[in-house]
């Protein structure tokens, strides 16, 4: 099972498996009980903003990156925090939004060819060890992809959300990516509490929808810290 | 065209190296998981190591771990099996195959790993 | 690791007779995005395994109609409407909804 190939490759630190897979939002627990871990609710919309915190950029979304919220302020506290778009200033690229790089500290388009080869080197030397960032979720990747001209719908395989037809995400499924829903109100989402508890996401859920947020569900409050079911609840 | 191609097979001596390669072509290859497959002469077919979309996750099979490593190039198209230490019982032909997350997709023709003295 | 069991292991059939194989897997293969993750090839002699059938029931493309794949859960069937000359081989049953994948013994289909 894939848990005894987790551990026969000697992974750390991973969550016990939960008690549902995280596949499809909404949908019924997965029958097979060898991949059960949780999935991804990092990709929050502006609208929704929650604060992440974090330590590196590859620990927030596709459209974020890591940082002290206030200009000079605690370097130790650090958070997940809007990409930037074109035109706005940068100190690196992970800064810029998806389909930018940062340019003598201003976020410019890379579709410019000269700048592949160099976003290539970026993943080609991450590719070196073979227990890295688990997640995996780093933009790096997806900057030199080509643009698609028609939106992936639900089951497609994409590159970042915007590949993704409105009110889909693009979140990891199996060791692929694949348009999903987003979530609807009441449906289960998945809320990292703190560093270092992406675990291994196999199946990733999207995020909220617009208006909503990734709670503890009400009639949860008394359960114990890892059973506590988080759904999407209107602000 | 949607394709895979994989080469670098050949005949070895026990405890010698070989690297595979698969070409990818006609899909966005970045966005899949891959996998190698293999099989012994006149046997079954059997899983050996899958490579997540990006390169961050890698797992094995028991009978290769630590002595295979799977990779992959998204700037080339190209997924990588780098064998170490080879024994007899790794001789097979090896195919790579596309992660089943949307359509399927049928694998290459295979190249042919033969480990002998 | 999900042990994949088929049966029979051989299968000797009258060209224009109907063949059926069953395969039987350890764990259930449905997924929770409503998928079924079970495949179905065909290798002929001398040459590589070519996907007959995915996720359970769809022919992939310029697959003949005569074959059809059926099941649910853990119990799932390949069938031959009328053998051809043509479908000699052998037949494995896939699943790959947990690594490793693993695949069926394989069920070695010969013409009378």
């Known amino acids: 099972t894939l848990n005894s190939v987790l551990n026969s490759n000697a992974i750390k630190n991973l969550p016990p498996p939960l008690g549902g897979a995280a596949g499809h939002p909404g949908s019924a627990v997965s029958a097979a009980p060898g991949i059960l871990y949780p999935g991804g609710n990092k990709y929050q919309t502006i609208d929704n903003y929650q604060p992440y915190p974090c330590a590196e950029d590859e620990e927030c979304g596709t459209d974020e990156y890591c940082a002290s919220p206030t200009r000079g302020g605690d370097a130790g506290v650090q958070i997940c925090l809007a990409c930037r778009k074109r035109r706005k200033r940068c100190m690196r690229h992970a800064m810029c939004c998806p389909g930018n790089y940062c340019k003598n500290g201003i976020c410019v388009s890379s579709d410019q060819n000269h700048f592949r080869g160099e976003i290539e080197e970026t993943i080609t030397e991450s590719f070196g060890n073979d227990h890295s960032t688990l997640d995996g979720y780093s933009r790096r990747t997806t900057l030199s992809s080509k643009m698609y001209h028609t939106k992936g719908q639900e089951g497609s395989v994409c590159l970042r959300s915007s590949d993704c037809a409105s009110g889909l995400c693009c979140a990891r499924h199996f060791w692929s990516k694949i348009c999903k829903p987003v979530l609807k109100e009441g449906q289960v989402c998945t809320k990292h509490r703190r560093k270092g508890s992406h675990g291994l996401e196999i199946f990733q859920r999207c995020y909220c929808g617009e208006g909503l947020s990734c709670r503890i569900q009400k009639d949860h409050h008394q359960a114990s810290n890892s059973s506590r079911l988080h759904t999407c609840q209107r602000h | 065209q949607v394709q895979l191609v994989e080469s670098g097979g050949g005949v070895v001596q026990p405890g010698r190296s070989l690297r595979l390669s698969c070409a990818a072509s006609g899909f966005t290859f970045s966005s899949y998981g891959m996998h190698w497959v293999r099989q012994a002469p006149g046997k079954g077919l059997g899983w050996v190591a899958v490579?997540?979309?990006?390169?961050?996750?890698?797992y094995y099979a028991d009978s290769v771990k630590g002595r295979f490593t799977i990779s992959r190039d998204n700037s080339k198209n190209t997924l990588y099996l780098q064998m170490n230490s080879l024994r007899a019982e790794d001789t097979a032909v090896y195919y790579c195959?596309?992660?089943?997350?949307?359509?399927?997709?049928?694998w290459g023709q295979g190249t042919t790993v033969t480990v002998s003295s | 690791d999900i042990v994949m069991t088929q049966s029979p292991l051989s299968l000797s059939v009258t060209p224009g007779q109907p063949a059926s194989i069953s395969c039987k897997s350890s764990q259930s293969l449905l997924h929770s995005d409503g998928k079924t993750y079970l495949y179905w090839y065909l290798q002929k002699p001398g040459q590589p395994p070519q996907l007959l059938i995915y996720e359970v029931s769809n022919r992939f493309s310029g697959v003949p109609d005569r074959f059809s794949g059926s099941g649910s859960g853990t119990d799932f069937t390949l069938k031959i409407s009328r053998v051809e000359a043509e479908d000699v081989g052998v037949y494995y049953c896939?699943?790959?909804?947990?690594?490793?994948?693993?695949f069926g013994q394989g069920t070695k289909v010969e013409i009378k």
């Open positions: 195959a596309r992660d089943l997350v949307d359509t399927a997709m049928p």
């Open positions: 896939m699943q790959s909804i947990q690594v490793p994948w693993t």
């Open positions: 490579i997540s979309y990006d390169g961050s996750d890698k």
